[in-house]
Interface confidence: low
């Protein structure tokens, strides 16, 4: 009778994680009696995958019952394969032996390639916000993919960038990968809107890439630009004069009124206008009694815009030309805060 | 950076129950399996159950087969164990673990929490 | 269940001498046994996996060898940061089991 041929007819197979790998071997003959076991890699390193004769493999299963006595398939499948399962196995045929079985003949071999779909690309920006004209730098993040090529792109708003460099680790074999890119990015004061997103393509994507965002809403400032007007006399001892905020984001502002240097007034940006380009416009007003002044005054308007040091804006009112009225001390009308702001 | 964090541990008298949860940080929690091993005061260590990625199978010890209850919810990276029934014997630091699993099972624990003191009184 | 028997149950030593702990399993258990490292009141560390394999980031100062029932952790030259308690675990059958471990003290 011819002598057993363990018999893989599979050289390689290729699953992708989560799914079952079926790993094929069939023997030839019946003779010698004695166990089949499954091993990953060879030589005297070789991991034992599953062993006919005893041990626990909760993720190998049969698929044949290896029991009954004509059985020659010992084909078995493993559940759950992840990057980490990929490797060479082997179907080996154990000879009855006394105190051990002893190892008869193995198969050819099956090699085992994981493809594995990268994680979620996230992108993160700085901690802190930046203004326009400024450099900033953003990183994208996936891991877990298998096999190592990839690809990754950067876009600022549909608009591909160049100016990024990318690493896929590690450099040499591994079960699985990951990729990390960091790109920079130019603000400009439109960039309220703006977003950038990285985008990765693999073999396990099917086309279909994955993409991360990040929106520039979280890390640019733009810083307001003030101006400070006088209006026509409203009454014939009160002008108007307001402090129009123009162009800043994000909204966190806070205005303060200082006549001569002496704080009149502080109030929070509240009910502001939204530009199209995501900035915000504010209008606060201060109606100044001129009669409580003898000399001129200078009115100055001071914002401070997202904890950033203030900047402020100066007019000086002329009151020479106002006739004066005796018993007045008060030089600015506090109106109701909800009279402030003219939006 | 992984992190491990138990909570649920305290006093509690024999006969009554007690849920241990694990909060999972800095990895995949849904591709690991876990595990709980406890060690009583002075003593060794000694493994209490394990768990697959999806729930299932799970194996227990056989001091605390029909009593305890691991379990898993993957979109809260969370690993529990319920304890009924509890006994003086019972008393121990419970770790969890992400078990490193490989073809034939969980087979090595790393890394493992800081552990939560479970003591059964009277 | 198998039984893991570690021995000593404790070792006195110096620091640089070469220190061996041996576990033996009740039955074979081919490489599928661990070593662990736990120091007072902290959780215990992973050394060694698959009998011999150093696990990532542990000095190389710390070896591993054997198969079947009968198993070496060696520490090359002791360190001061090595004095703690060793266990092993087998990790192919249910239940897992550990050994009692042993106590590596200062001499």
């Known amino acids: 009778e011819e002598e057993l041929q363990v018999i893989q007819p599979d050289k390689s197979v290729l699953v992708a994680a989560g799914e079952t790998a079926t790993l094929r071997c069939t023997a030839t003959s019946l003779i010698p009696v004695g166990p089949i076991q499954w091993f990953r890699g060879a030589g005297p390193g070789r991991e034992l995958i599953y062993n006919q004769k005893e041990g626990h493999f909760p993720r190998v299963t049969t698929v044949s019952d290896l029991t009954k006595r004509n059985n020659m398939d010992f084909s078995i499948r493993i559940g759950n394969i992840t990057p980490a399962d990929a490797g060479t196995y082997y179907c080996v045929k154990f000879r009855k032996g006394s105190p051990d079985d002893v190892e008869f003949k193995s198969g050819a071999g099956t090699e085992l390639s994981v493809r594995a779909k990268p994680s979620a690309p996230v992108v993160s920006g700085p901690a802190a916000r930046a203004t326009p004209q400024h450099t900033v730098s953003f990183t994208c993040e996936s891991h877990g993919f298998s096999p190592r090529d990839i690809t990754l792109k950067w876009f600022k708003n549909g608009n591909e960038l160049s100016d990024f460099q990318t690493n896929v680790d590690p450099v040499g074999e591994s079960v699985s990968y990951s990729i990390h890119s960091t790109a920079k990015v130019v603000l400009t004061r439109e960039d309220v809107h703006s977003q950038v997103i990285c985008e990765v393509a693999h073999v396990t994507l099917q086309g279909d890439p994955l993409r991360g965002t990040a929106n520039l809403s979280e890390t640019i400032r733009v810083p307001p630009t003030l101006e400070v007007t006088q209006q026509p006399v409203r009454a014939e001892n009160q002008v108007n004069v307001t402090c129009q905020v123009r162009k800043f984001y994000p909204q966190r502002l806070q205005l303060t009124w200082l006549e001569n240097g002496n704080v009149s007034r502080t109030e929070t940006a509240s009910t502001v206008t939204e530009n199209k380009d995501g900035t915000y416009n504010w209008m606060s007003w201060l109606l100044v009694n001129v009669s409580a002044h003898r000399d001129d005054v200078k009115l100055t308007c001071q914002v401070e815009h997202d904890g950033q040091p203030a900047v402020s804006k100066s007019h000086d009112l002329k009151v020479s030309a106002h006739p004066k009225e005796q018993g007045s001390n008060t030089a600015a009308e506090n109106t109701g805060s909800n009279e402030r702001n003219i939006y | 950076e992984v992190q491990l964090l138990e909570s649920g541990g305290g006093v509690v008298q024999p006969g009554r129950s007690l849920r241990l949860s694990c909060a999972a940080s800095?990895?995949?929690?849904?591709?690991?399996?876990m595990a709980w091993v406890r060690q009583a005061p002075g003593k060794g260590l000694e493994w209490v159950a394990v768990i697959w990625v999806d729930g299932s199978p799970k194996y227990y010890a056989d001091s605390v087969k029909g009593r305890f209850t691991i379990s898993r919810d993957n979109s809260k990276n969370t690993l529990y164990l319920q304890m009924n029934s509890l006994r003086a014997e019972d008393t121990a630091v419970y770790y969890c673990?992400?078990?490193?699993?490989?073809?034939?099972?969980?087979?090595?624990?790393?890394?493992w929490g800081q552990g939560t003191l479970v003591t059964v009184s009277s | 269940d198998i039984q893991m028997t570690q021995s000593p149950s404790s070792v006195s030593a110096s620091v640089g001498d070469r220190v061996t702990i041996t576990c033996r399993a009740s039955q074979g258990i081919s490489s599928w046994l661990a070593w662990y490292q736990q120091k007072p009141g902290k959780a215990p560390k992973l050394l060694i996996y698959?009998?011999?394999s150093l696990q990532s980031g542990v000095p190389s100062r710390f070896s591993g060898s054997g198969s079947g029932t009968d198993f070496t952790l060696t520490i090359s030259s002791l360190q001061p940061e090595d004095f703690a308690t060793y266990y092993c675990q087998q990790a192919i059958y249910f239940p897992i089991t550990f050994g009692g471990g042993t106590k590596v003290e200062i001499k």
């Open positions: 800095g990895f995949t929690f849904a591709h690991y399996g």
């Open positions: 673990a992400v078990a490193r699993e490989t073809y034939s099972g969980p087979n090595w624990f790393d890394p």
């Open positions: 698959a009998a011999s």
